[in-house]
Amino acid sequence: EEELQVIQPDKSVLVAAGETATLRCTATSLIPVGPIQWFRGAGPGRELIYNQKEGHFPRVTTVSDLTKRNNMDFSIRISNITPADAGTYYCVKFRKGSPDDVEFKSGAGTELSVRAKPS
């Protein structure tokens, strides 16, 4: 069986301030078991945007229903975009671990650019 890939098909997305951004991400396999997380930026200072396993993120909704056992679409929508949301967003697959899940594979990233509202 081929190893899971995390696919972010959009290199960049341009969204007007105040609108909703859709960041697309799919996995090619259900294996290994473990959650998806979305981050803005890379490295130790990256910002958690969405965590499938824990918490509620009021501005973030998933495009598909992640409670479905066979779901492999981890795309998200971020509402009410502001210029502060600009950056590169990474969809990251984690492998279930004990006590902590282990980062397994990251998508290539999607750069979100924000167009100012015309005044």
């Epitope: 959650p35 824990e54 229903d65 409670t67 479905k68 279930k96 006590p99």
Partner: antibody, heavy 120, light 107 residues
Framework: EVQLVESGGGVVQPGRSLRLSCAAS????????MIWVRQAPGKGLEWVAS????????YYADSVKGRFTISRDNSKNTLYLQMNSLRAEDTAVYYC?????????????WGQGTMVTVSS | AIQLTQSPSSLSASVGQRVTITCGAS??????MHWYQQKPGKAPKLLIY???NLEAGVPSRFSGSGSGTDFTLTISSLQPEDFATYYC?????????FGQGTKLEIK
């Protein structure tokens, strides 16, 4: 076999405290968010509090906020509910339940409940 | 908080009958609506998750549908063991909320 066993219920006077426990077995406790739900006699279900698998995210119903504290010890496979400043309206059967992964998931296993009676 | 309103509050039906219970949400919960069955003195049991998915081990006579604000639980042919109270519950956003329950009684 998945098992959730609540304990710690009883009769307590208004204003006093009580700590409920929920012992989990038959599954990897640290993978699951956990919930407390209560049911007053003859009434419906009311969500009380929830805690994520690593305790990073905790939420409370407005009716218990500031009085109840949910916590967990993953090394002991145990969930807790510390209840302070108890009121007559807290009288209920308290259930613990588990929730797989994120916030949107349902409560797929429940304990049998422990009765808390607040009365002078 | 999102309010859930179940209808009817109680229902008398006969074995073999088809029964429908509805749950309305005060705002959209997308598909994050779940249904539970509770018998007297027992803990609730998950029947349907995320609007239409049958939980493992639950008989196929139970089905769910809906999205947004309107949801339905259907029992295609009532069996004696189905007489119980049914609750809907949303998990779209905190706080989690339950409907007030629908008590299904034998006619």
């Amino acid at each position: 076999e998945v098992q959730l066993v609540e304990s710690g219920g009883g009769v307590v006077q208004p204003g006093r405290s009580l700590r409920l426990s929920c012992a989990a077995s038959g599954f990897t406790f640290s993978d699951y968010g956990m919930i407390w739900v209560r049911q007053a006699p003859g009434k419906g279900l009311e969500w009380v509090a929830s805690i994520s698998s690593s305790s990073s995210y905790i939420y409370y119903a407005d009716s218990v906020k500031g009085r109840f504290t949910i916590s967990r010890d993953n090394s002991k496979n145990t969930l807790y509910l510390q209840m302070n400043s108890l009121r007559a309206e807290d009288t209920a059967v308290y259930y613990c339940a588990r929730r797989y992964y994120g916030f949107n998931y349902p409560f797929d296993y429940w304990g049998q409940g422990t009765m808390v009676t607040v009365s002078s | 908080a999102i309010q859930l309103t179940q209808s009817p509050s109680s229902l008398s039906a006969s074995v073999g009958q088809r029964v429908t219970i509805t749950c309305g949400a005060s705002k959209s919960v997308r598909t994050y609506m779940h249904w539970y069955q509770q018998k007297p003195g027992k803990a609730p049991k998950l029947l349907i998750y995320s609007a239409s998915n049958l939980e493992a081990g639950v008989p196929s006579r139970f089905s769910g549908s809906g999205s947004g604000t309107d949801f339905t639980l259907t029992i295609s042919s009532l069996q004696p063991e189905d007489f119980a109270t049914y609750y809907c519950q949303q998990s779209n956003e905190p706080p989690y909320t339950f409907g007030q329950g629908t008590k299904l009684e034998i006619k």
